[in-house]
Interface confidence: medium
């Protein structure tokens, strides 16, 4: 229940990639505005996105304070132009979000192959250690900083002339693989957190192939 000219938000959804975290909801407002609050299970509520007509709110600044905490958000509905007005219970209508634990649930962004270098029959493939929006001591932490050994990468590689893929895994950001001399190879990587139950894998990186700009070829 509530005032006749406000409706409660619904379909509250967390959208999060590499800790960039936005709460989305419906409906598009008609004669109403929204305010979002966020809290940890044991903490105080903090208000964000005051009296907005948007149906999303960037909560990154809050969740990066401790990505291992579990957060809950709620969206309040107010009549446009009369934000002091409340529902029949003496407070504005609101709806709770699902719980969200960034460390366990943020999507892994698409990785990028930084470089590859061939030395004889070995190729070293390096994955870019992507920076997140988690910040400590004037340092934007990388995915590796945040996830440490929980994060692995899977490399898919194949001869340019065939479609048969091989795989390799690393718990660093580098692979060292054996290749056939004189053959060109293509590479794609995927970030993986094996211990997760949801959002375990990223999308595959763009494919990079030997004989193109990014790599370096040294025959020894």
């Amino acid at each position: 229940s509530g005032t006749t000219n406000t409706v409660a938000a619904y379909n509250l959804t967390w959208k999060s990639t590499n800790f960039k975290t936005i709460l989305e909801w419906e409906p598009k407002p008609v004669n109403q505005v929204y305010t979002v609050q966020i809290s940890t299970k044991s903490g105080d509520w903090k208000s964000k996105c005051f009296y907005t007509t948007d149906t999303e709110c960037d909560l990154t600044d809050e969740i990066v304070k401790d990505v291992k905490q579990t957060y809950l958000a709620r969206v309040f509905s107010y009549p446009a132009g009369n934000v002091e007005s409340t529902g029949s219970a003496g407070e504005p209508l609101y709806e709770n979000s699902p719980e969200f634990t960034p460390y366990l649930e943020t999507n892994l962004g698409q990785p990028t192959i930084q470089s590859f270098e061939q030395v004889g029959t070995k190729v070293n493939v390096t994955v870019e250690d992507e920076r997140t929006l988690v910040r400590r001591n004037n340092t934007f932490l990388s995915l590796r900083d945040v996830f440490g050994k929980d994060l692995i990468y899977t490399l898919y590689y194949w001869k340019s002339s065939s479609s048969g893929k091989k795989t390799a895994k690393t718990n660093t950001n580098e692979f060292l693989i054996d290749v056939d001399k004189g053959e060109n190879y293509c590479f794609s990587v995927q970030a993986v957190i094996p211990s997760r139950t949801v959002n375990r894998k990223s999308t595959d990186s763009p494919v990079e192939c030997m004989g193109q700009e990014k790599g370096e070829f040294r025959e020894i």
């Epitope: 304070k65 401790d66 990505v67 250690d129 400590r136 945040v146």
Partner: antibody
Framework: EVKLVESGGGLVQPGGSLRLSCATS????????MSWVRQPPGKALEWLGF??????????EYSASVKGRFTISRDNSQNILYLQMNTLRTEDSATYYC????????????WGQGTTLTVSS | DIQMTQSPSSLSASLGGEVTITCKAS??????IAWYQHKPGKGPRLLIH???TLQPGIPSRFSGSGSGRDYSFSVSNLEPEDIATYYC????????FGAGTKLELK
């Protein structure tokens, strides 16, 4: 297995200089922030400084107590962390530890066994 | 640099009892405080980060609270293995350890 092994401690006269080393193995050195922490005899731990990882350009930060006298550097080809100490004082006498630093929760997750510096005339 | 004033410097307690340690920062540290346990001959072990978040594998007998400049750390139902020196560490602006609290058995 992650290993950190400090070396280079000893007896130095006040005003002297010394360089400590920390040889590391068992992890990709360039991906981690590295730090120095000391503990004078019978006293508390004291953070001295850290050097950031490759993703953050290997930049350094220092505590006020050693800034301008101590310099942290790293040899990423040899996986060695250094602490260059100049204009040493008697109050710099301590056991010096290198530690791997996980910045997100301020965790020193691996420590060396320490090397002892005595500054005395 | 931010200063951390930790108290008491030592305390004694009985097995099964509870102890509380406090740390006061020289300025607001935005809840960026961690608590470490240090035993002789070992590297310090992180117990709690961001004021109250327990590290994986740390029993819930350990807890932390606080905000602004004032923070506290408690151990309940004391066990023999809890005998150690405990340090607070602020990580809001660089890093600063407190002076440590030596916990002994009565």
């Amino acid at each position: 297995e992650v290993k950190l092994v400090e070396s280079g401690g000893g007896l130095v006269q006040p005003g002297g200089s010394l360089r400590l080393s920390c040889a590391t193995s068992g992890f990709t050195f360039t991906e981690y922030h590295m730090s120095w922490v000391r503990q004078p005899p019978g006293k508390a731990l004291e953070w001295l400084g850290f050097i950031r990882n490759r993703a953050n350009g290997y930049t350094t930060e220092y505590s006020a107590s050693v800034k301008g006298r101590f310099t942290i550097s790293r040899d990423n080809s040899q996986n060695i962390l250094y602490l260059q100490m100049n204009t040493l004082r008697t109050e710099d006498s301590a056991t010096y530890y290198c530690a791997r630093l996980t910045m997100v929760v301020a965790e020193f997750d691996y420590w060396g066994q320490g090397t002892t510096l005595t500054v005395s005339s | 640099d931010i200063q951390m004033t930790q108290s008491p410097s030592s305390l004694s307690a009985s097995l099964g009892g509870e102890v509380t340690i406090t740390c006061k920062a020289s300025q607001d540290i935005n809840k960026y405080i961690a608590w470490y346990q240090h035993k002789p001959g070992k590297g310090p072990r992180l117990l709690i980060h961001y004021t109250s978040t327990l590290q994986p594998g740390i029993p819930s007998r350990f807890s932390g609270s606080g905000s602004g400049r004032d923070y506290s750390f408690s151990v309940s139902n004391l066990e023999p293995e809890d005998i150690a020196t405990y340090y607070c560490l602020q990580y809001d602006n660089l890093l600063t350890f407190g002076a440590g609290t030596k916990l002994e058995l009565k």
